[in-house]
């Protein structure tokens, strides 16, 4: 195709035309359409939805829309042998059983194929034993139990409340503590907002509601049987014993009505402090075991789920770029849901659908983006980001050479208070500039910009007059693009005013009550927040695909690198004596950051001055910007986490959802005072400082003048 197509940009075909074409009413219709039946990964219903989306994206005007299928390990409950938990008496009789399903919401009583609550990838088993309450089952909670309270979880069944950290980390921590089973439950303290009714009368979790979810510890591997490579027709699959990230002990989730029955009998120690108490009318005793008259009773789990290799389908749509078709800007979000997916993922999928429609409308009028835009409807995100990861594994060579940016599009809302953005520092200025041009949907901010309401409601902790932008962690489909491949990435959604509860999700998360009506009645009746999120996500994609010079500012990376270096240095300085003894110095890292700052500043000056009409120089400067994120990738990966290769950011080893800066150094320093061989431990700290310093310096040099 002739690159002249790019000149087909009339004033009408600008960002404004794209944004004006986005309609709240369409998002609403798409959401309704996507949420009438369950779309569980690996099911016929989700395959049919994939084909529907393929067909509609073609109608919208994309150049091509293909299905990309993979055969990956999924997990399902046994339909004839349900999972449940019992309290058994000394004779082994079951005197209490947890519920087998969630009471269906009004209007959905006759829907078939609602998967009952389960922890995906739990092994089968029927362990019985004494219960220990482990709070959120975070690393620090197990430290409290084992080191302070001297409570041994070995051979016990632990019960943990959902929230604060990714459930897979909870299970990993329980396994390491020697537990033989894990019960996960939603405590009203975390999933029932005061003053709000439970569904269907409000957006709170009812007592019978349960959060589903996978409990893997994949660390970016994708399909557990084919780490590093696509699960295609000729794939070599590992045996189940060698599969990546599978839990080794049975796990099952319950609601707070059932949790009450287990927790009210708990004996042993009182909880260590107020942070271990939820909102149920129980003492929150830690155990081990039940109190007094109930001390001979035990808890028994009955788990019969099976792991099965199953076909999944991504939908990949292409809108070819007119000038730089070999440069890819990707907008992706998942399609599979646990049940109806009213928020997760369909509030995001509906927004993607409307963005595709708007781009398609412009294309039908003769416009093309400068760069190629790829649209993706990922499958099996809920089972461990499998669809996106397998596709990226299959296309890794193309992506690492051509990938400009990835914008994620899962749930558009987790509240209706303000915007929430997590992204690479390269996108800070893009996000700031874009949100200054968009209208705020917030009450009390009529006629004001989104930037203004966002900054007021969610101010940056470091820079006054600027909004908070968070680090990318994981738990969503950007992971493979950012953490493994080093493609600049970002995500945006509307959130709640609940900073302290950042990683707990909204009350009805992954429950049967996550319906269209939940969104339409309680979260966003006018779909104005969805529209705003569509404008932010779509606007970012438009700019990334269409601006002549990539809208990346490398100076913002310099600023955060200094902040992260200061932070990790201060953590290390909690051990001044050991730093002296083992000659630990951060000089090389600070020197590299200083060099990066100076080189980034000079690069930015050149970026203002160069001749943009020279396509070779333009391409060269853009490539330096595109490849900057790639320069932070260490091909060897992080220790024991080969698919987390970004040296500046990784998902926290203690919470997959959270991002950690300089993760290699951070993990080397973590709990270092408890290491049996301090010399070896501090040696690893020094090695990680070396890796980080080298990487920052190497990245800086990619911004230097090429000759």
């Amino acid at each position: 195709k002739s690159s002249n197509e790019a000149t087909n940009i009339t004033p009408k075909h600008n960002m404004k035309a794209f944004l004006d074409e986005l309609k709240a009413e369409n998002i609403k219709k798409f959401l309704y359409n996507f949420t009438q039946i369950p779309h569980l990964a690996g099911t016929e219903q989700n395959f049919q939805l994939a084909k529907q989306i393929q067909s509609q994206w073609k109608e919208f005007g994309l150049d091509s829309v293909e299905l990309a299928h993979y055969d990956v390990l999924l997990s399902y409950p046994n339909k004839t042998h349900p999972n449940y938990i019992s309290i058994i008496n000394e004779d082994g009789n079951e005197i209490f059983n947890t519920s087998l399903f969630e009471p269906p919401p009004p209007g959905y009583e006759n829907v078939s194929d609602i998967v009952p609550p389960f922890s995906a990838f739990s092994p089968q088993g029927m362990p019985e034993g004494d219960l220990v309450y482990v709070n959120y089952a975070r690393t620090e909670d197990f430290f409290k139990l084992e080191r302070d309270m001297k409570i041994n979880c070995s051979g016990k069944i632990v019960i943990a409340r959902y929230g604060k950290v990714f459930r897979g980390n909870k299970v990993k921590n329980a396994q390491l503590a020697g537990a033989k089973g894990v019960i996960l439950y939603s405590d009203p303290a975390d999933y029932f907002a005061p003053g709000v009714k439970s569904y269907p009368d409000g957006w709170n979790l009812p007592g019978g509601g349960v959060q589903r979810g996978n409990i893997l510890n994949l660390n970016g591997a994708g399909d557990p049987l084919t780490p590093g490579y696509p699960a295609n027709e000729y794939a070599y699959r590992r045996g189940i014993a060698e599969a990546v990230g599978l839990p080794s002990i049975p796990v099952h989730p319950i609601g707070y009505y059932d949790a009450q029955k287990l927790l009210e009998k708990m004996g042993g120690s009182a909880p260590p402090d107020s942070s271990w108490r939820g909102s149920l009318k129980v003492p929150y005793n830690v155990g081990p075991g039940f109190t007094g008259n109930f001390s001979t009773q035990k808890v028994k789990m009955h788990i019969h789920s099976t792991n099965e290799v199953t076909r999944i389908y991504n939908v990949i749509g292409t809108l070819r770029g007119a000038v730089e078709p070999d440069r890819y800007v990707i907008l992706g979000g998942h399609r599979d849901s646990w049940v109806f997916g009213g928020i997760d993922p369909q509030s995001g999928a509906a927004v993607v659908h409307e963005i595709v429609r708007s781009f398609g409308t412009l294309k039908k009028e003769g416009w093309r983006p400068r760069r190629t835009i790829l649209f993706a409807s990922w499958d099996a995100e809920e089972f461990g980001l499998l669809g996106s990861t397998e596709w990226a594994e299959e296309n890794s060579r193309l992506l690492q050479e051509r990938g400009v940016a990835y914008i994620n599009a899962d749930s558009s809302i987790e509240g209706n208070y303000t915007l929430r953005v997590d992204c690479t520092p390269l996108m800070y200025s893009l996000v700031h500039n874009l949100t200054k041009e968009l209208k705020s949907p917030d009450e009390g901010f009529e006629g004001k910009s989104l930037y203004e309401s966002w900054t007021k409601k969610s101010p940056s902790p470091e820079f006054s007059g600027m909004p908070r932008i968070s680090k990318l962690g994981s738990g969503n489909d950007f992971e493979v693009f950012f953490q493994r491949l080093g493609i600049a990435s970002g995500r945006a959604r509307y959130t709640k005013n609940w900073e302290t509860n950042k990683f707990s999700g909204y009350p009805l998360y992954h429950s049967v009550y996550e319906t269209y009506e939940l969104v339409e009645k309680f979260y966003d009746p006018m779909f104005k927040y969805h529209l705003t999120v569509a404008q932010v996500r779509g606007g970012m994609v438009f700019e990334l695909a269409n601006s002549i010079v990539l809208p990346f500012d490398c100076r913002d990376y310099a600023v955060v690198l200094r902040k992260y270096a200061d932070k990790i240095y201060s953590i290390s300085m909690k051990h001044p004596q050991e730093m002296k003894t083992y000659s630990v110095s951060f000089d090389s890292l600070f020197s590299a950051v200083k060099n990066f700052t100076e080189i980034a500043s000079k690069f930015s000056e050149r970026l203002q001055d160069f001749d943009k009409s020279n396509p070779i120089v333009l391409r060269m400067m853009n490539d330096q910007l595109m490849f900057l994120e790639r320069a932070f990738i260490d091909p060897l990966g992080l220790p024991d986490r080969p698919f987390y290769r970004h040296v500046i950011y990784a998902p926290s080893s203690h919470n997959k959802y959270a991002g950690e800066s300089f993760p290699g150094i951070y993990d080397a320093l973590f709990d270092i005072e408890s290491k049996v061989d301090p010399s070896k431990a501090w040696g690893e700290v020094k090695r990680q400082i070396y890796v980080a310093a080298f990487t920052v310096q190497a990245a800086a040099e990619t911004l230097s003048e090429v000759a």
Epitope: S269, P272, T291, G292
Partner: antibody, heavy 115, light 107 residues
């Protein structure tokens, strides 16, 4: 070696407040619960409350009806106990103890409440 | 509040003889009981936690036992340095409560 060093003796008038400090060393401060316990002359021990230094979570003995406040300063590995609206029966030795099971104790701080 | 009742109030035992100290909880506390030793003009020291586990460095002549409501601290062979007041404490429910103490002396 674990050490808890408390601030010196105090003499206070009824109605006043007292703030006792407890500087810890020899272990990871955030790892152990800090408790405050008092012992009136010739009497048994009375638990006042505790704090999780990692997150500031506290639990108080309701007997003290909001008169007691326990805080920590992680940067100096120091815990504090403030008791307000003092009365003569608050005259006691006040101890801090580290560890859920009161594994390590401070040397005690004598607080005398007298008009 | 759970009341911890210690008996006897005081106990005189010959050197090398066994001392048995009792502690009764007003309700079931499982095994959430500690024992402390306080020598004159000193801070208390932890001896036994979780009813029966000796704290680091505590001589093996000190043994804790019991569960539910009845707990015992036994000093198998009393030494001169064991002269002290011994307190039990429950942590099954808040507020944590101590017994009034048993004073151990040499006969």
């Amino acid at each position: 070696e674990v050490q808890l060093v408390q601030s010196g003796a105090e003499v206070k008038k009824p109605g006043a407040s007292v703030k006792v400090s407890c500087k810890t060393s020899g272990y990871t401060f955030t790892e152990y619960t800090i408790h405050w316990v008092r012992q009136a002359p010739g009497q048994s021990l009375e638990w006042m409350g505790n704090i999780n230094p990692n997150n500031g979570g506290t639990t108080y003995n309701q007997k003290f009806q909001g008169r007691v406040t326990i805080t920590v300063d992680k940067s100096t590995s120091t815990a504090y106990m403030e008791l307000s609206s003092l009365r003569s029966e608050d005259t006691a030795v006040y101890y801090c103890a580290a560890g859920w099971n009161f594994d390590y104790w401070g040397q005690g701080t004598l607080v005398t409440v007298s008009s | 509040d759970i009341v911890m009742t210690q008996s006897p109030d005081s106990l005189a035992v010959s050197l090398g003889e066994r001392a048995t100290l009792s502690c009764r909880a007003s309700q079931d506390v499982g095994t959430a009981v500690d024992w402390y030793q306080q020598k004159p003009d000193q801070s208390p020291k932890l001896l036994i936690y979780w009813a029966s586990t000796r704290h680091t460095g505590v001589p093996d002549r000190f043994t804790g036992s019991g569960s539910g409501t009845d707990f015992t601290l036994t000093i198998s062979s009393l030494q001169a340095e064991d002269v002290a007041v011994y307190f039990c404490q429950q942590y099954n429910s808040y507020p944590k409560t101590f017994g009034a103490g048993t004073k151990v002396e040499i006969k």
